[in-house]
Interface confidence: low
Amino acid sequence: IVLRPSRVHNSEENTMRALTLKDILNGTFSYKTFFPNWISGQEYLHQSADNNIVLYNIETGQSYTILSNRTMKSVNASNYGLSPDRQFVYLESDYSKLWRYSYTATYYIYDLSNGEFVRGNELPRPIQYLCWSPVGSKLAYVYQNNIYLKQRPGDPPFQITFNGRENKIFNGIPDWVYEEEMLATKYALWWSPNGKFLAYAEFNDTDIPVIAYSYYGDEQYPRTINIPYPKAGAKNPVVRIFIIDTTYPAYVGPQEVPVPAMIASSDYYFSWLTWVTDERVCLQWLKRVQNVSVLSICDFREDWQTWDCPKTQEHIEESRTGWAGGFFVSTPVFSYDAISYYKIFSDKDGYKHIHYIKDTVENAIQITSGKWEAINIFRVTQDSLFYSSNEFEEYPGRRNIYRISIGSYPPSKKCVTCHLRKERCQYYTASFSDYAKYYALVCYGPGIPISTLHDGRTDQEIKILEENKELENALKNIQLPKEEIKKLEVDEITLWYKMILPPQFDRSKKYPLLIQVYGGPCSQSVRSVFAVNWISYLASKEGMVIALVDGRGTAFQGDKLLYAVYRKLGVYEVEDQITAVRKFIEMGFIDEKRIAIWGWSYGGYVSSLALASGTGLFKCGIAVAPVSSWEYYASVYTERFMGLPTKDDNLEHYKNSTVMARAEYFRNVDYLLIHGTADDNVHFQNSAQIAKALVNAQVDFQAMWYSDQNHGLSGLSTNHLYTHMTHFLKQCFSLSD
């Protein structure tokens, strides 16, 4: 059993209340985290509660405001960025969201030395991306798909690229599919460590088919949104990487970095770029059939001002049992010799672990090992490597931070976080200052989140940065549900689950069960984190039992589980949810006539297939923004797990795994189908096709669309959505309103 915030005494029980839906929709019980904005080994910036930008020096204990809330407010700034030479700050306003990571904004440059905004040669608007060089105060920015450079904020810009065109050529920013499925960033440009060079990607979407959907707005005629979006098997973007010398950008102009021959021989992706030194860069490439990745280390040839990527510096990573990497191929963390690096990939037993590569991948030295997985390398210093894993006490849904001493032999390992606040904190991330002099630990649960500052040498806690006292006080009179994380062993498969139980849970009674599912490849739902959300309310107020199950295809438990779904999406994920439900029924406290399942996105796909499994287990279910056929989803994501929808590859399973193929099986369940009409990610087309198939099969169902809403169904739609789903479930479970 996971302990929640301390309970008040029974005498005060009558003052306790259940969670309400309003609590959830208002965000009454949301928590805060504190991530320092590090600017040196011992200094960080933080935006105070009253919106001043404050610089903290850990060693002197001093703090001072570098930018007042008055200055911030004068341009309605919602974000800021200090130049590394500390002479200027950019202020970001007029934030306008585009896709998951991308947005445009207006930028103002404030000169800290004279306390005035820089006038003359102001930046154009709106800008798609802007960043300082890592040293000094050069600016690189993307405007109308072209990259510009300023040596100083007040200087006229130097235009680096000229061919940028909306929806055609993207320079320094990703197109839709690279943003969502490969880079997971809004930018595609990278400064070298001292700002000498600027590397950038150019994406050519000229030949990509376009998804078009109506945006209704308020006008007489709807607008049409057009996005180059490669669905499975379609033509993909063509990517090229260029590097330009920013000291004298016009001298040779941008130089293209060559693609490794074994990659360039067929369709490929660029997956990431890591600068090693100012004159050494590491690029990662991936074949379109994503089981071969090549890491290529390139050196600047000053004689011809070109980038040389010798075959001897190509490192191949190949998977024979699935796709390369986890969700993404991991990125290298280079050591101080600027050629060897640390990287996470599968070991011979099929667990993702840290390896040290000095010359070849074949000769890699394994740094961590065991039937658990290394998840992230945070920092490598000259004597330590900091990483996170789920090793401790064999709970895959935990994250602890470890330090390996690489300066000594044999290397020694220490868990930095395992015993700090053991009951409260089992899921950590970390943020390190320069040279790991200090670091912040951010604990996400299972108790109330807490952020702390630590000495990078001794690991000693220096101070609490954020402990969510107000939240703790607010929760004192709330009857929170109980949570437990356990596992089921079924046919040599371990199914970890999280069960959320009503506050007065009694094993001898029967409760309605709601399965919340995501289930996508390399995801994890069963995590030791704190949350007060919709399902907390359903357990607290409506007396439901909610369960989350990590089945085959999910992450951090080895390749056997992860790659089980390779080329077979929609089979084992569904089977494992059903298996778990049967096991829950055997536990004796589930009312088997009142079982529901719901999910969003991939979870909507799984919940739909589970409802249409013909098992008779589910009374009802909800699919929010589901995928309905893998032929409708993005190439980069889909083909990673499914291969190509061609006769000689995997077309048959593409066809067999659709929701539409199972339309008849929805006849005996109550189905609520929900989708936003402006979903750029999982297109409304998916739900439109489900609805059409159900109508053609003369199957009754319920549906809700959200006009002009995207995949996140945000704003007022969120309130409407959860209210609507609550009514649906309460009706399904015969719970009074």
Epitope: F158, T161, F162, N163, F242, D245, T247, Y248, P249, A250, Y251, V252, G253, P254, Q255, E256, R301, E302, D303, W304, Q305
Partner: antibody, heavy 116, light 112 residues
Framework: QVQLVQSGAEVKKPGSSVKVSCKAS????????ISWVRQAPGQGLEWMGG????????TYAQKFQGRVTITADKSTSTAYMELSSLRSEDTAVYYC?????????WGQGTTVTVSS | DIVMTQSPLSLPVTPGEPASISCRSS???????????LDWYLQKPGQSPQLLIY???NRASGVPDRFSGSGSGTDFTLKISRVEAEDVGVYYC?????????FGQGTKVEIK
């Protein structure tokens, strides 16, 4: 401000060699190409070759291959051009130039006269 | 080697009037990155050459805006919108699309 200062005028006999120096001051020397360009009396500019001091590998125009050697000494920020087997048609002003994007820097020129 | 051909070789001009010099290369100077690797230089009498235009069309630092460069691939033009007396000298185009750079023969601009 970057300045390239070249060595003084030379008078050489046919068949001999000449070595012209070019010292950079007031800016970064190493990462940028130092080119050597010559101009015979009343004639146009002729690119002879170049070197990036950081790398030390020189490139030469085909016409001068085997006769010209371009070197650089990073420690003194000096580039050198040595031309051997001199003939009368090598009489010219020899310039060193540093490429640098939107501006360039040239030496004042060194007059080499080849005469018997 | 890439051969650069300039025309005319001599250009008498009237102050205040426009002037134009052409430069043709034996191979395309358009790089795959979209830049044309062609520069224009002016050598005034008794001086070292000075850079006027780089990458086909970009004015070098401190160059008056009466100078402009255009063209792509193999054909390039340098234009002076209104010639001034100080513009006299020899104008050279230079390619740097490959490792071995080459100059044009030069165009001598003099006042009529």
């Amino acid at each position: 401000q970057v300045q390239l200062v070249q060595s003084g005028a030379e008078v050489k006999k046919p068949g001999s060699s000449v070595k012209v120096s070019c010292k950079a001051s007031g800016g970064t020397f190493s990462p940028y190409t130092i080119s050597w360009v010559r101009q015979a009396p009343g004639q146009g500019l002729e690119w002879m070759g170049g070197i990036v001091p950081n790398v030390g590998v020189a490139t030469y125009a085909q016409k001068f291959q085997g006769r010209v050697t371009i070197t650089a000494d990073k420690s003194t920020s000096t580039a050198y051009m040595e031309l051997s087997s001199l003939r009368s048609e090598d009489t010219a002003v020899y310039y060193c130039a540093r490429d640098a994007a939107d501006r360039d820097y040239w030496g004042q020129g060194t007059t080499v006269t080849v005469s018997s | 080697d890439i051969v650069m051909t300039q025309s005319p070789l001599s250009l008498p001009v009237t102050p205040g009037e426009p002037a134009s010099i052409s430069c043709r290369s034996s191979q395309s100077l358009l790089h795959s990155n979209g830049y044309n690797y062609l520069d224009w230089y002016l050598q005034k009498p008794g001086q070292s050459p000075q850079l006027l235009i780089y990458l086909g069309s970009n004015r070098a630092s401190g160059v008056p805006d009466r100078f402009s460069g255009s063209g792509s691939g193999t054909d390039f033009t340098l234009k002076i919108s209104r010639v001034e007396a100080e513009d006299v000298g020899v104008y050279y185009c230079q390619q740097r699309n490959n490792k071995n750079r080459t100059f044009g023969q030069g165009t001598k601009v003099e006042i009529k």
